[in-house]
């Protein structure tokens, strides 16, 4: 239904707290350099305006679209050109071009310092003084660093944060209560961010149809007892929600997500037997819970997939009558039978099936042609299964840090032109797949590994797009989203690369490394490892291990020395010489 005032409608639906949070996220994602105070001022102005519209929907400007209202606010910011350069040109455009322009200027890798967590005592003091401002800072800092973070989900993480602080700040040992809990939230939020970015990439590059196919596969795996019409309805609604969030329409997105959660809870009987626990929770927790609810039990009497999609004489007729519906049904039927496959794999199989029908249905004897299609799926299924086995075996042998290093070597060889910080970030993230997925039961490993890797590689592609340097990466990133991971896996050493000169300063370290937290120490060592590979792309694993062991020993010795500075300045050059010799 049409509302006289869109802003009043959303304010009423969402309530003041969520309304303000979402407007803050929207502004922080669009203008990533502005301070919290600048954004908080705009949010208050927008909220005050929304309240006047709630009181009188016919008041001046209340009939304007949200894009117009928000865009006008952003464009009124002083010194916009000085701080944001060409983004200010967006303000010369009319809606909807202005909003599109803002979206195009979102920066996936803003030059902002890492979000440092204050020490426990200070955190608790500022939280107790003003919980609202404290949580506002959290929303602002996360949103500006992750301009595509799924807004209603960020509100959920803020709520988690709030609950942890409320609980831990009342404890005697605040630090040991806060640290593991907040680390857990941070880890989950970072994974949520890369997953959502992947969804937005899918939507931006390949349109709603591609996202809807993803949704059909995912929902069919989770709700195998729901019929195709129900899955299609859920996929259509979920596509709308994600389209809105990816497009910066955060109020509509959060409102529609709440509606979808409500619908699911009112229709549990036709969707899944596993929803009740989620449906008993308050809104943000309910929607989050539904998004990661466990798979329902598969119906026991499902016929073989071949019956309708291979053996039936009507295959080509059904395909001709409604291509998308027929392929959608195939994806639904295959996915509900395979919760043990990744969504990426299911989409590759559907694509293979579509290509087979395109070819075979044009032949004089189609059934003889498409009769072997399921057998042709086998290599497509075996490839990711082998990937999971090989990588989980390696992870179990090396542990997370060692596994990250193995991946770092592999990816630096595949794309040595990529900047070292990007390679290290990618390898560290890709390496976390071991901890995240390899400990799961066998039937959950493949979907966990491949869909997580795909999301991380999407980030690699986004960063590479800004400054393309590797033909290998460009090739893998320009194909379809579901083919990226197999493409990267298949890359070998880049033979076109001219090795980097050996620079002693790259491998020169100082005593300040000793006081760094373990994570930062690892990053320093991994940076050196990537640089070594860039210097000697064909170095053997054994050579690299020798050098890295020597390096670790050097750090250990010098960090324990009484005079650390002297140790680093005398032993450092020796280390560099030994490294050169070992790699000669």
């Amino acid at each position: 239904e049409a509302h006289k005032s869109e802003i009043a409608h959303r304010y009423n639906d969402l309530g003041e707290q969520h309304f303000k949070g979402l407007v803050l996220i929207a502004f922080s994602q669009y203008l990533q350099k502005c301070s919290y105070d600048e954004h908080a001022k705009l949010v208050q102005e927008v909220t005050d305006f929304a309240k006047t519209c709630v009181a009188d929907e016919s008041a001046a400007n209340c009939d304007k679209s949200l894009h117009t209202l928000f865009g006008d606010k952003l464009c009124a910011i002083p010194n916009l050109r000085e701080n944001y350069g060409e983004l200010a040109d967006c303000c010369t455009k009319q809606e909807p071009e202005r909003n599109e322009c803002f979206l195009q200027h979102k920066d996936d890798n803003p030059s902002l310092p890492p979000f440092e967590r204050p020490e426990a005592e200070a955190m608790c003091t500022s939280f107790k003084e003003n919980p609202t401002t404290f949580m506002g800072h959290y929303l602002h800092e996360v949103a500006r660093r992750h301009p595509y973070f799924y807004a209603p989900e960020l509100l959920y993480y803020a709520e988690q944060y709030n609950e942890i602080l409320t609980q831990c700040c009342a404890e005697a040992d605040k630090e040991s209560c806060l640290t593991p809990k907040l680390d857990g939230v941070k880890e989950k939020a970072l994974v949520s961010s890369v997953r959502q970015r992947m969804k937005c990439s899918s939507m931006q590059k390949f349109g709603e149809r591609a996202f809807k196919a993803w949704a059909v596969a995912r929902l069919s795996q989770t709700f195998p007892n729901a019929d195709f019409a129900e899955i299609t309805k859920l996929a259509t609604d979920l596509t709308k929600v994600n389209k809105e969030c990816c497009h910066g329409d955060l109020l509509e997105c959060a409102d529609d997500r709440a509606e979808l959660a409500k619908y699911m809870c009112e229709n549990q009987a036709t969707i899944s037997s596993k929803l009740q626990t989620c449906c008993d929770k308050p809104l943000l927790k309910k929607a989050h819970c539904l998004s990661e609810v466990e798979h329902d039990t598969m119906p026991a009497d499902l016929p073989a997939i071949a019956a309708d999609f291979v053996e039936d004489q009507e295959v080509c007729k059904n395909y001709a009558e409604a291509k998308d519906v027929f392929l959608g049904t195939f994806l639904y039927e295959y996915s509900r039978r395979h919760p043990d496959y990744s969504v990426s794999l299911l989409l590759r199989l559907a694509k293979k099936y579509e290509a087979t029908l395109e070819k075979c249905c044009a032949e004089a004897n189609p059934p003889a042609c498409y009769g072997t299609v399921l057998a042709e799926f086998q290599p497509l299924v075996e490839e990711p299964k082998n990937l999971v086995k090989t990588n989980c075996d390696l992870y179990e042998k090396l542990g997370e840090y060692g596994f990250q290093n193995a991946i770092l070597v592999r990816y630096t060889q595949k794309a040595p032109q990529v900047s070292t910080p990007t390679l290290v970030e990618a390898a560290r993230n890709l390496g976390r797949v071991g901890t995240k997925c390899c400990t799961l039961p066998e039937d959950q490993r493949l979907p966990c590994v491949e869909d997580y890797l795909s999301a991380i590689l999407n980030r690699v592609c986004l960063l590479h797009e800004k400054t393309p340097v590797s033909e290998h990466v460009t090739k893998c990133c320009s194909g379809s989203l579901v083919e990226r991971r197999p493409c990267f896996s298949a890359l070998t050493v880049d033979e076109t690369y001219v090795p980097k000169e050996f620079k002693a300063e790259t491998f020169t370290f100082h005593s300040d490394i000793c006081t760094l937290p373990e994570k930062e120490k690892q990053i320093k060592k991994q940076t050196a490892l990537a640089e070594l590979v860039k210097h000697k792309p064909k170095a053997t694993a054994e050579q690299l291990k020798t050098v890295m062991d020597d390096f670790a020993q050097f750090l250990d010795t010098c960090c324990k020395a009484a005079d650390k500075d002297t140790c680093f300045s005398t032993e450092g050059p020796n280390l560099v010489t030994r490294c050169k010799d070992a790699l000669a």
Partner: nanobody
Framework: GVQLLESGGGLVQPGGSLRLSCAAS????????MSWVRQAPGKGLEWVSS????????LYADSVKGRFTISRDNSKNTLYLQMNSLRPEDTAVYYC????????SSQGTLVTVSS
């Protein structure tokens, strides 16, 4: 949706000829192989002939080989069946179908071969 409309049937003497047409709409005609199937009074459905989307490949049932010719005009979205040397046992309702389908969803056209 998909529509198939057969025409050209009628009464013909043994040894005579007929040309059946099938006008197709609602799908990308040139992307699909097409077939003719027939059903004689009181009998089951019998496959007659098939042609690929480009028209380069054709297949015939042994019972009609050498007498019938299947063809298509993709610019007109039309399928044809040229039937020569007709026999009484060719009497049937003829249907055009998509791909290897042995089910019909159209009216068909009646061919009667009788003296």
């Amino acid at each position: 949706g998909v529509q198939l409309l057969e025409s050209g049937g009628g009464l013909v003497q043994p040894g005579g000829s007929l040309r059946l047409s099938c006008a197709a709409s609602g799908f990308t005609f040139s992307s699909f192989g097409m077939s003719w199937v027939r059903q004689a009074p009181g009998k089951g459905l019998e496959w007659v002939s098939s042609i690929s989307g480009t028209g380069s490949d054709t297949l015939y049932a042994d019972s009609v080989k050498g007498r019938f010719t299947i063809s298509r005009d993709n610019s007109k979205n039309t399928l044809y069946l040229q039937m020569n040397s007709l026999r009484p046992e060719d009497t049937a309702v003829y249907y055009c179908t998509i791909g290897g389908s042995l089910r019909y969803s159209s009216q068909g056209t009646l061919v009667t071969v009788s003296s």
